[in-house]
C-alpha cells in the first residue's frame, strides 16, 4: 500500500510541478519593474520569455513578442532551452509514471517492468525539476547582475544636466512559481524513485512445497518458482504465493481523477 | 457618444467644503480611471487625482492629498469629489477627464467653477 | 515632480503659416520597455474645456485634424500646426504622461494676426 501511495502522491507532485513549470515558461512577469523609491507608478514594465510589456495606469497594456532569434542575449536563450527541455521530459515522464502506475492495469505488464517504468519516469522528473530550477536561476542571476549594473541615474541631456531615470528591473513572479514548480517536479520524480524500489520484484526465498504423486516422492526445489510445463500460451516462470492470496500492494484500485487547475 | 457632465457652479465660505459631481454616460464607467483638474482664473492646468470607479481605487497628487477625496457611485455612473478647508487659492474651475491609453485624458467634462468667498 | 517647459508662451501668426511650438521636461519621459514617449498635447479654446491632440508624443487621436504634428523624444517635444486656421487660435498644453503627478507645462497661446 505505502508504494502505491508513493508511486501515486509522486505522479501528483510531478503533475502539479510540470503543469507549474508550463506555466512560468508561459507568464510575462519574468521580470517586473523595479518600483525601489516610486511605489505608484504611470508606466510599469515587465518581461518574459517570449515578449515584454507595459501597463500604463489607464489601464491599457501592450506587449510585444521577441521576433528575432539572432538579436536575443545568449543567456535568454539559454534558459528558454532549459525550460522547454524541462517541459518535454516532464510531459514523457508524465506519459510513462501514467503506464507505470500499479493502480493502472495494462495488459499483464510485470512488476518488473513498472518499477522500471517508475524508475525511469523518476529520473525524467528530477531532470525535468533540475532544468526548470537551473532556467530559472540563471534568469535570476542575470537580473541581479544586471540589477547592479544599471545606474539608477545617469545624466544626459544637451545643454544641461537633466536627469534620466533608468529602468531596473528585479524578479517577477514567473522566477517564483518556477523556483516551487521544479522542486515540486524534483520531489516527485524522489517520490518515483523510492517507489521504484519497493515495485521491484525481489529474489525472495519461499517455503518449499512438498507434492506427493502416487508411487513417486517429487519435491520441488526451493525458490517458489513453478516448472514451465509448457502447457498454455504462457512459458514465463512465476512465483507461487502461498494460499494464492493478494497482498494489499496487489489489489486492484481504480485510477482516482484528479483536477487540474 | 461619450460624455461627462458636471455639477453647476458653486459659491462657497473659506473653511468649508464642497463636493462637486462628474455623471459619465456613453461608455463602461467602471472600466475607466476618472482624473480631476484644477484650472485657476488665468492660470495653467494641474492634476489633481483619479479614481477608478471598477474598485475605488485611487492615486493623488501629494499636493492635494488630505484636501481632496474622490468617490465613485457606479449605480448612478457619477464620481465625486470633495475639497475640504477651502481658501481663495481653491477658487477655480475644476474639470473631470476619463483616462485612456497613452496616460491620456481623451474625455473632458464642462468644468464646475468654485468661488470661494466670505 | 517632473518640470514641463513651455515655449513661446505666445505665438502670433497669420492664417496658412506654419507654426512650431516647444516642450521641455526635466526628466525623460521615453520609456524604454516600448520605445514610447509619454507626452500627451492638449488644445484648449477660450471658455472651453482642454481637447486632447496628440498622445505618446506623436499618436494623433482621431477626428483631429493632419495639419497637427506631435514629434520628438526624451525631453525635447514639439508641436508643429502646418497651415494655421482660425479655428485654431487656443492655448496648446503639454503634458507628462510618464510619471506621477502627471504635470502641464505653462501653455502655449496662439494668435491669429
Known amino acids: 500500500m505505502a508504494v502505491t501511495a508513493c508511486q501515486g502522491l509522486g505522479f501528483v507532485v510531478s503533475l502539479i510541478g510540470i503543469a507549474g513549470i508550463i506555466a512560468a515558461t508561459c507568464m510575462d512577469q519574468w521580470s517586473t519593474q523595479d518600483l525601489y523609491n516610486n511605489p505608484v507608478t504611470a508606466v510599469f514594465n515587465y518581461q518574459g520569455l517570449w515578449r515584454s510589456c507595459v501597463r500604463e495606469s489607464s489601464g491599457f497594456t501592450e506587449c510585444r513578442g521577441y521576433f528575432t532569434l539572432l538579436g536575443l542575449p545568449a543567456m535568454l536563450q539559454a534558459v528558454r532551452a532549459l525550460m522547454i527541455v524541462g517541459i518535454v521530459l516532464g510531459a514523457i515522464g508524465l506519459l510513462v509514471s501514467i503506464f507505470a502506475l500499479k493502480c493502472i492495469r495494462i495488459g499483464s505488464m510485470e512488476d518488473s517492468a513498472k518499477a522500471n517504468m517508475t524508475l525511469t519516469s523518476g529520473i525524467m522528473f528530477i531532470v525535468s525539476g533540475l532544468c526548470a530550477i537551473a532556467g530559472v536561476s540563471v534568469f535570476a542571476n542575470m537580473l541581479v547582475t544586471n540589477f547592479w549594473m544599471s545606474t539608477a541615474n545617469m545624466y544626459t541631456g544637451m545643454g544641461g544636466m537633466v536627469q534620466t531615470v533608468q529602468t531596473r528591473y528585479t524578479f517577477g513572479a514567473a522566477l517564483f512559481v518556477g523556483w516551487v514548480a521544479g522542486g515540486l517536479t524534483l520531489i516527485g520524480g524522489v517520490m518515483m524513485c523510492i517507489a521504484c524500489r519497493g515495485l521491484a520484484p525481489e529474489e525472495t526465498n519461499y517455503k518449499a512445497v512438498s507434492y506427493h504423486a502416487s508411487g513417486h516422492s517429487v519435491a520441488y526445489k526451493p525458490g517458489g518458482f513453478k516448472a514451465s510445463t509448457g502447457f498454455g500460451s504462457n512459458t514465463k516462470n512465476k512465483k507461487i504465493y502461498d494460499g494464492g492470496a493478494r497482498t494489499e500492494d496487489e489489489v486492484q484500485s481504480y485510477p482516482s481523477k484528479h483536477d487540474y487547475v | 457618444q461619450v460624455q461627462l457632465q458636471q455639477s453647476g457652479a458653486e459659491l462657497v465660505r473659506p473653511g468649508s467644503s464642497v463636493k462637486i459631481s462628474c455623471k459619465a454616460s456613453?461608455?463602461?464607467?467602471?472600466?475607466?480611471?476618472m482624473n480631476w483638474v484644477k484650472q485657476r482664473p488665468g492660470q495653467g492646468l494641474e492634476w489633481i487625482g483619479q479614481?477608478?470607479?471598477?474598485?475605488?481605487?485611487?492615486t493623488y497628487n501629494g499636493k492635494f492629498k488630505g484636501q481632496a477625496t474622490l468617490t465613485a457611485d457606479k449605480s448612478s455612473s457619477t464620481v465625486y469629489m470633495q475639497l475640504s478647508s477651502l481658501t481663495s487659492e481653491d477658487s477655480a474651475v475644476y474639470f473631470c477627464?476619463?483616462?485612456?491609453?497613452?496616460?491620456?485624458?481623451?474625455?473632458w467634462g464642462q468644468g464646475t467653477s468654485v468661488t470661494v468667498s466670505s | 515632480d517632473i518640470v514641463m517647459t513651455q515655449s513661446p508662451s505666445s505665438l502670433t501668426v497669420t492664417a496658412g503659416e506654419k507654426v512650431t511650438m516647444s516642450c521641455k521636461s526635466s526628466?525623460?519621459?521615453?520609456?524604454?520597455?516600448?520605445?514610447?514617449?509619454?507626452l500627451t498635447w492638449y488644445q484648449q479654446n477660450p471658455g472651453q474645456p482642454p481637447k486632447m491632440l496628440i498622445y505618446?508624443?506623436?499618436t494623433r487621436e482621431s477626428g483631429v485634424p493632419d495639419r497637427f504634428t506631435g514629434s520628438g523624444s526624451g525631453i525635447d517635444f514639439s508641436l508643429t500646426i502646418s497651415s494655421v486656421q482660425a479655428e485654431d487660435l487656443a492655448l496648446y498644453y503639454c503634458?507628462?504622461?510618464?510619471?506621477?503627478?502627471?504635470?502641464f507645462g505653462s501653455g502655449t497661446k496662439l494668435e491669429i494676426k
Open positions: 503634458q507628462n504622461a510618464y510619471s506621477y503627478p502627471f504635470t
Open positions: 456613453g461608455y463602461a464607467f467602471s472600466s475607466y480611471w
Open positions: 526628466q525623460s519621459l521615453l520609456n524604454s520597455g516600448n520605445q514610447k514617449n509619454y
Open positions: 479614481i477608478y470607479p471598477g474598485n475605488g481605487d485611487t
Open positions: 505618446w508624443a506623436s
Open positions: 477627464a476619463r483616462f485612456v491609453k497613452g496616460n491620456a485624458m481623451d474625455y
